[in-house]
Each structure stands twice: as C-alpha cells, then as structure tokens.
Interface confidence: low
C-alpha cells in the first residue's frame, strides 16, 4: 500500500493542472467510502470501484497500478459494488479530486483493513439515462 501514496499524488498533480477551482469535498468522500462504523474504516473492495470510476481521465499506467494493488488486497470472494457517478457535474469533479487528494495525503491508507465491512453508502449513485457511471 505504500506505493499508493506517490502514485495518487502523481495523478492528483496531473488532474489539478487540468482542473482549477474545484474544491475537495470531504462530505463526498464520507458518503461514498465509509462504513457506518466510527471512526470511518475502509477496505479495498469499498475503494476499488472509485478508482475504476476515475480511470477515464487518469494516466492508463498509473491508475492500473493502483487498481492492481487494491485488487491484491481484496478478499477473493468479496463482492465489489459497481458504482454510478454522474457525468458532467461539479460534484463529479470534486469527487475525483477528493479521492486523489485523500490518497495522496495517505489519510486513507492507514484506514485500510483486511476485514470486510458493510457496503459503503453510495452517495453519488445515479441511474439517469445517458449518464455513464465511469464516464468523466
């Protein structure tokens, strides 16, 4: 997991060059990634779908390395929730930025646990026609 921080930082810097004026949204992060437990705990199955979700506008090689690492940490038969993130919304940009910022700081890395947790609350779920959940 140690590699996750520098890899995420690289993606973050690249994303920030493209998108200015988009604030980090801790609320989005908590809605999407945390369990009901306190303090927030995360596992790779909860996080993986979000890295898959930001794949489209990320460097192919770097994002795939991150996904590969998270895949290794996943319990073999643990279900992975597919998520739907609205295309073309300010919240979506904020969401991507938040994911990258949190991992760049290493704040989420220490919260990763090997023990499965309940499915995260999917705060950004959208099933509207014509909106692609991995399309940013």
């Amino acid at each position: 997991m140690l590699e996750l921080q520098p890899l995420s930082r690289g993606l973050l810097e690249d994303y920030q060059k493209k998108e200015t004026g988009v604030p980090e949204s801790n609320r989005t992060l908590l809605l999407c990634l945390t369990s009901d437990s306190q303090p927030p705990r995360l596992n790779s199955s909860a996080i993986l779908p979000y890295f898959r979700a930001i794949r489209p506008l990320s460097d192919k090689n770097i994002i795939d390395k991150i996904i590969e690492q998270l895949d290794k940490l996943k319990f073999q038969h643990e279900p992975e929730t597919e998520i739907s993130v609205p295309a073309d919304t300010f919240e979506c940009k904020s969401f991507i930025l938040t994911i990258l910022q949190q991992f760049s700081k290493g704040e989420l890395n220490s919260k990763l646990e090997g023990k499965p947790i309940p499915n995260p609350l999917l705060g950004l779920d959208s099933t509207r026609t014509g909106h692609h959940h991995h399309h940013h």
């Epitope: 994303y15 060059k17 493209k18 998108e19 898959r52 794949r55 489209p56 506008l57 990320s58 192919k60 994002i63 996904i67 992975e80 597919e82 739907s84 295309a87 073309d88 940009k93 991507i96 099933t127 026609t129 014509g130 909106h131 692609h132 959940h133 991995h134 399309h135 940013h136």
Partner: antibody
C-alpha cells in the same frame, strides 16, 4: 494478446431475432466494460450498446433501446447481443469492442455479419 | 446527439508529406480539461484500430508519426511523414455523452 472473436451473424428476415456472441481472451475480461459497434454497408460506424465491467449498467442509443439487449457472462469470458424486431437498417458488420475506462474503445474483434432481408 | 463532421472526405498525400484530418463536433466534447475524442484507423477488410485516445494520447504500439490535438469542438489528426501503410479510412469518435457518435470517415490515399 487480446482476442475478441464474434459469432452468430446470419441472414434473418425483418422482425426476426438473432443472438451474437463474443469470446474474449488474453485479458482480464471482468475488469473491462464492453461494447458492440456496427458498420453499415455504406461504411458508417454506429455505437450499438455498452455494458459495465460487472454487468450492472447497460447503455443503448434510442434507435436500439427496447430491441437489443447486451449482456455478459464473466465466468465464461463472453459478451452477448440479443437482437429482436430486426429491421433492414440493422444490416451491418457487428464488432465486439473492449472498453478502456469506458470512454475509449481500444480493441476490436474481426466482426460478424448480420443481414436483415426478406 | 453530438454530430461529428470530418473533413475532407478523402485526400491524397505524397509519400513523406503531411496528412491533416479535421473533426468538428456540434458541441463541446471536452470534460475536466480533456477532449473525449478518439481516432481510429481502418484498412480495407479489417476492423478499426485505435490510434489516438482522449484527443492527444498515442495508443501503445502506434507509430509516433501519428498525433492528435484539439479541444472542445475542433480536433485534428496529423500524420507526418506519411507512409504507404497509412492508406486507410480514419474515423473520429466522441465519448463525451451518450449516444457515442462517429465521424463519417476520411479516406487517405498515398500518392
């Protein structure tokens, strides 16, 4: 090496049905979104359908919606396209396509030919 | 739907010269600073092959003589220097919104 092999194309009468299959190999099929794209006799390319990596989400253009169904069997590494209420304008070469991050189609199969004619 | 207009419909370029193909979208296809426009090459009797993804990224294994540029509504595929094997039809495609749409194609002939 990424390989996508389509099958099931045939000559069918208007109003008929057909099921296309695409056998995928050389990559982790369950990690990728997949699409069907067709090429009409006048060589125009048309997007037909997309399915997410786990199969939870499907997308279609309006002229296809309700007539075609895209599905996948990740255990068998196979993509499907069930076509019904076929029209003459559905005559085309149908390509199975791998998606990268859903916004890019990076590998295309050789295609399977569908002809709708009475 | 987003309409993609490619020009020219066909062009003939001398070996070693530059080929420029344009793709204009009826509305912006950029998102988060990235143009969601892709370029494909199709040779007779073959399936399309991805050349450039997200406006300017060269797909692995594609020769560096191919390059893409542009943003919002105007995108360009450049081939320089043109080689014999580049004779093909080139398509642009947007994935900014559903339905995904393709340009009508540009047929490149090598003189």
């Amino acid at each position: 090496e990424v390989q996508l092999v389509e099958s099931g194309g045939d000559l069918v009468k208007p109003g008929g049905s057909l099921k296309l299959s695409c056998a995928a190999s050389g990559f982790s099929f369950s990690n990728y979104g997949m699409s069907w794209v067709r090429q009409t006799p006048d060589k125009r390319l048309e997007w037909v359908a997309t399915i997410s990596y786990g199969g939870s989400y499907t997308y279609y253009p309006d002229n296809i919606k309700g007539r075609f169904t895209i599905s996948r069997d990740n255990a068998k590494n196979t993509l499907y396209l069930q076509m019904s209420s076929l029209k003459s304008e559905d005559t085309a070469m149908y390509y199975c396509v791998r998606g990268y991050g859903y916004d890019t189609m990076d590998y295309w199969g050789q295609g399977t030919s569908v002809t709708v004619s009475s | 739907d987003i309409l993609l207009t490619q020009s020219p419909a066909s062009l003939a370029v001398s070996l070693g010269q530059r080929a420029i193909i344009s793709c204009k979208a009826s509305q912006s296809v950029s998102f988060a600073g990235t143009g969601l426009m892709h370029w494909y090459q199709q040779k007779p009797g073959q399936q399309p092959k991805l050349l450039i993804y997200r406006a300017s990224n060269l797909e692995a294994g594609v020769p560096t003589r191919f390059s893409g540029s542009g943003s919002r509504t105007d995108f360009t595929l450049n081939i320089h220097p043109v080689e014999e094997e580049d004779a093909a039809t080139y398509f642009c495609q947007q994935s900014r919104e559903y339905p995904w749409t393709f340009g009508g194609g540009t047929k490149l002939e090598i003189k």
